[in-house]
Interface confidence: medium
């Protein structure tokens, strides 16, 4: 059966300069490729993570992805800032040239609070 | 307090259609995701469709999906569910339900309209 | 599409008993489990969200415990008013949303 990303959360909300979790998990790992988080849709949306070698300040994967048995792909962002806000999607890849995007999650909108 | 109240329920011939309304008050009914929730009679609760609060999404069951069609006007905080090519396993009550805003479960009910399909 | 099994479907107890309803899940729904009670003639009531947390309203006789698969619901004490049909809900797994079949308890 088809790949499912599932993202629990329609929104979050945090204040600003803390950290919040932003869940989503896999049902399989199949077929093989990356899975990357975005803000937004569409030509202009932002690389958030990557679930690679890259390093992307103030986001951090929950779980340890390179664990084979590992279907858990949430993150964490810290130090929130109201440029932060937006709609956050998880998106299962196919490898390939290039990778083809196969799967979205339902996305989380991350609303950030006034300290 | 949050209040939703249906209407349009009735009895139809199978194949016909029938369009059934919810009104909403108490909440924001715009940024609220809204959904159909069916009980046929002596059976248990099925989800049947669901609308984001902007009216952009939609999903449905396979059982309804290509003759039910959901919207919403949110100038009226109204929702809607036209329903076409009715067959006699559609006879059911019907509940307007609204989501929780964090999360898909239903944090209020209407107390439903009834959809009896019989020729 | 996360199938939910309930049991006992029909439950008979005296007012004054503890009620121990079940709801299984076909695959892992973490904590995202909803309790509704729903009574002739009168709208579906949100009793318990996230497998355990009260809805606001909600006597403290009801509580909700479980993960994963299995989750219970428990009236330590039932009431007149609470003899209804008790269904749960995942929603974790994004549409369809799934509830399971229903528990029926009935005054012995």
């Known amino acids: 059966t088809e790949v499912k990303v599932i993202q629990p959360e329609k929104s979050v909300s945090v204040a600003a300069g803390d950290s919040t979790v932003l869940n989503c998990t896999l049902t399989s790992l199949l077929p093989v490729g990356p899975i990357r988080w975005y803000r937004g849709v569409g030509q202009s949306r932002q690389l958030i993570y990557s679930f690679t070698t890259e390093h992307f300040p103030r986001v951090t994967n929950v779980s340890d992805a390179t664990k084979r048995s590992n279907l858990d792909f949430s993150i964490r962002i810290s130090n929130v800032t109201p440029e932060d806000a937006g709609t956050y999607y998880c998106v299962k890849f196919q490898r390939g040239s290039p990778d083809t995007e196969i799967q979205s999650g339902g996305g989380t909108e991350v609303y950030v609070l006034a300290k | 307090d949050v209040q939703l109240v249906e209407s349009g329920g009735g009895v139809v011939r199978p194949g016909e259609s029938l369009r059934l309304s919810c009104a909403a008050s108490?909440?924001?009914?715009?940024?609220?995701?809204m959904n159909w929730v069916r009980q046929a009679p002596g059976e248990g609760l099925e989800w049947v469709s669901l609308?984001?609060?902007?009216?952009?999404?939609?999903y449905y069951a396979d059982s309804v999906k290509g003759r039910f069609t959901i919207s919403r006007d949110n100038s009226k905080n109204t929702l809607y569910l036209q329903m076409n090519s009715l067959r006699a396993e559609d006879t059911a009550v019907y509940y307007c339900?609204?989501?929780?805003?964090?999360?898909?479960?239903?944090?209020?009910w209407g107390l439903g309209t009834l959809v009896t399909v019989s020729s | 599409e996360t199938v939910l099994t309930q049991s006992p479907g029909i439950l008979s107890l005296s007012p004054g008993e503890r009620a121990t309803l079940t709801c299984r899940a076909s695959?892992?729904?973490?904590?995202?489990l909803a309790w509704y009670q729903e009574k002739p003639g009168q709208a579906p009531r949100l009793l318990i969200y996230?497998?355990?947390s009260r809805a606001a309203g909600i006597p403290d006789r009801f509580s909700g415990s479980g993960s994963g698969t299995e989750f219970t619901l428990t009236i330590s004490s039932l009431q007149s008013e609470d003899f209804a049909v008790y269904y749960c809900?995942?929603?974790?797994?994004?549409?369809?949303?799934?509830f399971g079949g229903g528990t029926k308890v009935e005054i012995k």
């Open positions: 339900a609204k989501e929780n805003d964090r999360y898909r479960f239903f944090d209020y």
């Open positions: 108490g909440f924001t009914f715009s940024t609220s995701d």
């Open positions: 609308i984001s609060g902007s009216g952009e999404i939609t």
């Open positions: 695959q892992s729904v973490y904590t995202y």
């Open positions: 996230g497998a355990s």
């Open positions: 809900q995942q929603y974790y797994d994004r549409p369809p949303l799934t």
